[in-house]
């Protein structure tokens, strides 16, 4: 229904706390360089204005769209051009072009320092002094670094953060209580960020139809007892929610997500038997829980997929009558039978089926042509299954750090032109798939591995788009989203690459490395490894292992030495010489 004042409507629906949080996230995602205080001031002004509209919907400007109101606020910021350059040009446009312009200027890799966590005592002091401001800082810092973070989900993580701090700040040993818990939230939030970015990429590059197909597959796997009409309704609603969040319409997105959660909980009987636990929770926890609810038990009496989609004489007729509906029912039926497949694989199979019908239905004898389509799925299914087996075996043999290094070598050989920090970040993220997925039961591995890898590779593509340097990467990134992972997996050593000349300073280290946290040490070593591969792209695994073992031994020795500086300055050049010889 239409409301006289959109801002009053959203304020009433969401309540002040969530309203303020979402407005803060929106501003932080649009203007990523502004300080917390600058944004907090804008949020307060918007909230005060919303309250006047709640009191009187006919008050001046209350009838304006949210984009107009928010855009006007952003454009009134002093020094906009000095701080944001051409983003200021957006302010010369009218809605909806102005909002589109803001969206195009979102930076997936802003030049902001890493979000450092203060030490426990300091955190607890500032949390106790002003919990609201503390959580505001959290929302601001995460949102500006992750401009497509799913806003209602970020509110959920802030709530988790709040609960952890409330609990741990009352403990004697705050540090050991906080660290593992906050690390867990951080890890989950980072995964949530790359997954959501993938959804927004799907929406931006391929439109709502592509996202809806993803949603149909995912929902059909989770709710195999729901009928096609129910799955279509949920997919349509979920598409709307994600479109709004990806488009910066965060208040509408959060409101509609709450509505969707309410609908699911009111219609459990026709959706799934597994929803009750989620539905008993408060709003943010409920919506989060529903988004990762376990799969319902598959119906026992499902007929073979071939009956309706291969053996039926009406296949081409049904396809002609309503292509999207027919393909949608195929995707639904196939997905509900295969919770053990990744969504990417299911979409590849649906695409293959569509291409087969396009070709076969134009023939004089279509059934003879499409009769073998299910058999033709086999190689498409085997490829990711082999990928999972090979990589999980390697992970089990090497552990996470060793597995990351193996991936780093592999990807540096595939795309040596890509910057070393990007390669290291990608390899570290790709390598985490082992810890995340390889420990799961067999039937959960494939969906976990492939859908996670696809999300990480989407980030690689986004970063590469900014400064394209590798034809290999451009080729894989310009295809469809579901073909990206197989494309990257199939890449081999880039034969066109001219190796980097050996620079001793790249492999020169100082005693300050000894005091770095373990993660930072690993990144330094992985940076050196990527540089080695760029110098010798065809170095064997044995050669690289020899060099890296020598390097690790050198660090261990010098970091234990009484005079670390002398050790580094004398042993360092020897290490460089040995490395050159080993790779000669």
């Amino acid at each position: 229904e239409a409301h006289k004042s959109e801002i009053a409507h959203r304020y009433n629906d969401l309540g002040e706390q969530h309203f303020k949080g979402l407005v803060l996230i929106a501003f932080s995602q649009y203007l990523q360089k502004c300080s917390y205080d600058e944004h907090a001031k804008l949020v307060q002004e918007v909230t005060d204005f919303a309250k006047t509209c709640v009191a009187d919907e006919s008050a001046a400007n209350c009838d304006k769209s949210l984009h107009t109101l928010f855009g006007d606020k952003l454009c009134a910021i002093p020094n906009l051009r000095e701080n944001y350059g051409e983003l200021a040009d957006c302010c010369t446009k009218q809605e909806p072009e102005r909002n589109e312009c803001f969206l195009q200027h979102k930076d997936d890799n802003p030049s902001l320092p890493p979000f450092e966590r203060p030490e426990a005592e300091a955190m607890c002091t500032s949390f106790k002094e002003n919990p609201t401001t503390f959580m505001g800082h959290y929302l601001h810092e995460v949102a500006r670094r992750h401009p497509y973070f799913y806003a209602p989900e970020l509110l959920y993580y802030a709530e988790q953060y709040n609960e952890i701090l409330t609990q741990c700040c009352a403990e004697a040993d705050k540090e050991s209580c906080l660290t593992p818990k906050l690390d867990g939230v951080k890890e989950k939030a980072l995964v949530s960020s790359v997954r959501q970015r993938m959804k927004c990429s799907s929406m931006q590059k391929f439109g709502e139809r592509a996202f809806k197909a993803w949603a149909v597959a995912r929902l059909s796997q989770t709710f195999p007892n729901a009928d096609f009409a129910e799955i279509t309704k949920l997919a349509t609603d979920l598409t709307k929610v994600n479109k709004e969040c990806c488009h910066g319409d965060l208040l509408e997105c959060a409101d509609d997500r709450a509505e969707l959660a309410k609908y699911m909980c009111e219609n459990q009987a026709t959706i799934s038997s597994k929803l009750q636990t989620c539905c008993d929770k408060p709003l943010l926890k409920k919506a989060h829980c529903l988004s990762e609810v376990e799969h319902d038990t598959m119906p026992a009496d499902l007929p073979a997929i071939a009956a309706d989609f291969v053996e039926d004489q009406e296949v081409c007729k049904n396809y002609a009558e309503a292509k999207d509906v027919f393909l949608g029912t195929f995707l639904y039926e196939y997905s509900r039978r295969h919770p053990d497949y990744s969504v990417s694989l299911l979409l590849r199979l649906a695409k293959k089926y569509e291409a087969t019908l396009e070709k076969c239905c134009a023939e004089a004898n279509p059934p003879a042509c499409y009769g073998t389509v299910l058999a033709e799925f086999q190689p498409l299914v085997e490829e990711p299954k082999n990928l999972v087996k090979t990589n999980c075996d390697l992970y089990e043999k090497l552990g996470e750090y060793g597995f990351q290094n193996a991936i780093l070598v592999r990807y540096t050989q595939k795309a040596p032109q890509v910057s070393t920090p990007t390669l290291v970040e990608a390899a570290r993220n790709l390598g985490r798939v082992g810890t995340k997925c390889c420990t799961l039961p067999e039937d959960q591995r494939l969906p976990c591995v492939e859908d996670y890898l696809s999300a990480i590779l989407n980030r690689v593509c986004l970063l590469h788009e900014k400064t394209p340097v590798s034809e290999h990467v451009t080729k894989c990134c310009s295809g469809s989203l579901v073909e990206r992972r197989p494309c990257f997996s199939a890449l081999t050593v880039d034969e066109t690459y001219v190796p980097k000349e050996f620079k001793a300073e790249t492999f020169t280290f100082h005693s300050d490395i000894c005091t770095l946290p373990e993660k930072e040490k690993q990144i330094k070593k992985q940076t050196a490894l990527a540089e080695l591969v760029k110098h010798k792209p065809k170095a064997t695994a044995e050669q690289l292992k020899t060099v890296m073992d020598d390097f690790a031994q050198f660090l261990d020795t010098c970091c234990k030495a009484a005079d670390k500086d002398t050790c580094f300055s004398t042993e360092g050049p020897n290490l460089v010489t040995r490395c050159k010889d080993a790779l000669a």
Epitope: Q313, E314, V315, C316, K317, Y319, A320, E321, E358, C361, A362, E363, A364, N365, P366, P367
Partner: nanobody
Framework: EVQLVESGGGLVQPGNSLRLSCAAS????????MSWVRQAPGKGLEWVSS????????LYADSVKGRFTISRDNAKTTLYLQMNSLRPEDTAVYYC????????SSQGTLVTVSS
Amino acid sequence: EVQLVESGGGLVQPGNSLRLSCAASGFTFSSFGMSWVRQAPGKGLEWVSSISGSGSDTLYADSVKGRFTISRDNAKTTLYLQMNSLRPEDTAVYYCTIGGSLSPSSQGTLVTVSS
């Protein structure tokens, strides 16, 4: 909405000819193979002939081979069946269908071959 409308049927004497037409709408006609099927009084459906989307490939039931010719005009989204040397056993309601479908969704056109 997919629509198929057959026309051109009628009463003819054995040995004579008839040309059936099927006007199609509501789908990408050139992307689909089309068929003619028929149902004689008191009998089941029988496949007669099929043609590919481009019109380059055709198939015929043995009972009509050499006498019937299937063709199509993609610009007019129309399917044809030229029937020569008609026999009494060709008497039936003729339907056009999409792809290899044997169950018609249209009214059909009645062809009666009788002296």
